[in-house]
Amino acid sequence: FERTRSLQDPCSNCPAGTFCDNNRNQICSPCPPNSFSSAGGQRTCDICRQCKGVFRTRKECSSTSNAECDCTPGFHCLGAGCSMCEQDCKQGQELTKKGCKDCCFGTFNDQKRGICRPWTNCSLDGKSVLVNGTKERDVVCGPSPADLSPGASSVTPPAPAREPGHSPQ
């Protein structure tokens, strides 16, 4: 079958790193500089991706594989194959159209990317709050109030600083 196919279509014999050159009677020609073909039987070579600006090169292009990019410090990858770089924010913040903004009270973000998410509602699981939430951390749920011995408090006293979730003025 392979032999039959190669007789019918000479391009099927062209290996990765080459293309089937219609201008030269369909012989296999090596990819020109800064282009690649990652599979055999290609009729063209693809231009290498260039990692410019906020992108930086993670893997150089070769004649058989495309370059791979990641993001410069302070940014992170989004999309398949790091098609976009998005600005990092601090923990306790989320990226908006106007830049990094602190999480609203009752929400948190423990990463430098993504959005602020609501604190866990411990009462939905019949539990009580063991540790208060902050902009950077979710609440910690403890045992249900019925499980606690009389007189014991489940909530740790708040830090002497500002109220959790509010940004300094």
Epitope: S29, P30, C31, P32, P33, N34, C61, S62, S63, T64
Partner: nanobody, 111 residues
């Protein structure tokens, strides 16, 4: 334009070796791929080996393990070392770079 001249062909017995040379004159760039092709009588011109623009050597199945391609950019020369030659390696061997081709050198493997 680039001119390419092949040499080193000849008559050799099966199992023997030959070293083909491709000398370039004119403006040839180190990033430009250099290739060796061969054409047996009545057959298509087939790629044998090439040094890609990223300077990595590649071989088609017929050449793997027996042939070695190398280049010296300062001397504008590319070589194809052919070992363990077989009867089916008989062909005219051409070197190519970009749109330029040499005139070919005959390799005959015969006992």
């Amino acid at each position: 334009a680039v001119q390419l001249v092949e040499s080193g062909g000849g008559l050799v017995q099966p199992g023997g070796s030959l070293r083909l040379t491709c000398a370039a004159s004119g403006d040839i760039f180190s990033s430009q791929p250099m290739s060796w092709y061969r054409q047996a009588p009545g057959k298509r011109r087939d790629l044998v080996a090439w040094i890609a623009w990223d300077n990595i050597a590649h071989y088609t199945d017929s050449a793997k393990g027996r042939f070695t391609i190398s280049r010296d950019n300062t001397k504008k020369t590319t070589w194809l070392q052919m070992n363990s030659l077989k009867l089916e390696d008989t062909a005219v061997y051409y070197c190519a770079s970009g749109d330029s081709w040499g005139q070919g050198t005959q390799v005959t493997v015969s006992s």
